[in-house]
Interface confidence: low
């Protein structure tokens, strides 16, 4: 039931006085002040929420055209996300070159390890099996990542092979034709 004596219920936003002190009684003044503050707080929050929803909608709409603006990161099915990268851990085994070609077919590369956190994550996640990563070297040449950048000795690589893999302790190397599981990596996909 609408109570015409209840100012709190009667006041609409357009009827709020510019100065709440203009109300005659103290009780009405306090109520009007609270209503005024509450109204503007609700309006403020509504504007912020609406703005965020609109911004996110626009961002998501642009995801495919401008991936860099997308906020919500995701990885393809059967890929694992870690620190803005997606990793694929194979079940199959291949030689180093075929492993890289598999990664290439997925718009990825054999994993490039860029931090100790990433290395520890890969070592933890891959389990006990050896997995190829994207490091290789030509005879007498320094180790290089798949994209051609030189390896900066972030971790030791044991062995005398030309291609690197992760084992249960860290990194080692072997001939490219030996068969192992592999890890692909690529930048995360934004959706």
């Amino acid at each position: 039931m609408h109570d015409s004596n209840n100012v709190e219920k009667d006041i609409t936003p357009s009827e709020l006085p510019a100065n709440p002190g203009c109300l005659h009684s103290k009780e009405h003044s306090i109520k009007a002040t609270l209503i005024w503050r509450l109204f503007f707080l609700i309006m403020f929050l509504t504007i912020i929420v609406c703005g965020m929803v609109a911004a996110l909608s626009a961002i998501r709409a642009n995801c495919h055209q401008e991936p860099s603006v997308c906020l919500q990161a995701a990885c393809p099915e059967s890929w694992i996300g870690f620190q803005r990268k997606c990793f694929y851990f194979s079940d199959d085994t291949k030689n180093w070159t075929s492993s890289q070609r598999f990664c290439d077919s997925q718009d990825a590369d054999l994993a490039q390890v860029e931090s100790f956190q990433e290395l520890n994550f890969l070592l933890r996640y891959k389990g006990p099996s050896d997995h190829w990563i994207g490091l290789s070297r030509e005879q007498g040449q320094p180790w290089k990542w798949i994209n051609g950048t030189e390896w900066t000795r972030q971790f030791p690589i044991l062995g005398a092979g030309e291609c690197a893999y992760l084992n249960d302790k860290g990194a080692s190397s072997a001939r490219h034709y030996t068969e192992r599981k592999w890890i692909c990596s690529k930048s995360d996909i934004h959706v």
Epitope: T97, S98, R101, L110, I146, N147, G148
Partner: antibody, heavy 123, light 108 residues
Framework: QVTLKESGPTLVKPTQTLTLTCTFS??????????VGWIRQPPGKALEWLAL???????RYSPSLKSRLTITKDTSKNQVVLTMTNMDPVDTATYYC???????????????WGQGTLVTVSS | ETTLTQSPGTLSLSPGERVSLSCRAS???????LAWYQQRPGQAPSLLIY???SRAAGVPDRFSGSGSGTDFALTISRVEPEDFAVYYC?????????FGQGTRLEIK
Amino acid sequence: QVTLKESGPTLVKPTQTLTLTCTFSGFSLSTSGVGVGWIRQPPGKALEWLALIYWDDDKRYSPSLKSRLTITKDTSKNQVVLTMTNMDPVDTATYYCAHRLDSSGRGGYFDYWGQGTLVTVSS
Amino acid sequence: ETTLTQSPGTLSLSPGERVSLSCRASQNVYSNFLAWYQQRPGQAPSLLIYGASSRAAGVPDRFSGSGSGTDFALTISRVEPEDFAVYYCQQYGTSPITFGQGTRLEIK
């Protein structure tokens, strides 16, 4: 010494299927890293990559022609076969096969080429 | 797909001159996986340069390759009569493999 030689019909009618064979020597298509590719060149025009097959039977095709191409290998005969369906006069070109050593996992350059075979598509 | 644009289309010069041919990619060529080929009239292409700057076996040292990213060049320090031919660049860093449209080197 690596050699490659293309063979197949010199004249094909529109809508027919072209079958080309590349017979090679001096390398084995069972050796890790080895691939054989097909490239074509219309008269007076640029080179266009068509297809590629690797020692492990991995196959790659040009996206624009993928639906029309099939590449296969016969390791024992040292042969690679390319078939191209629904031939059209615009497919008139010299067709080359070439050897490729993929040591990077991202493919490689073509270091040995066949002499090429001119295929004319006309009714 | 990576589009390769070669310039100029045709180049007229005399034997003994130095020449640079340009190959520009529409996007970075992955790990500078770019090759140059020479094609003489009526012959198949032959590999000159791979990896942007490495000379293939048997290629005279007057041929050199340079560049990275999107801009590459093939330089012939002193053009010999047998060098008059068409030159193609090719990228093999990303699928599909693509070739440039070629630069024809002709005698002035």
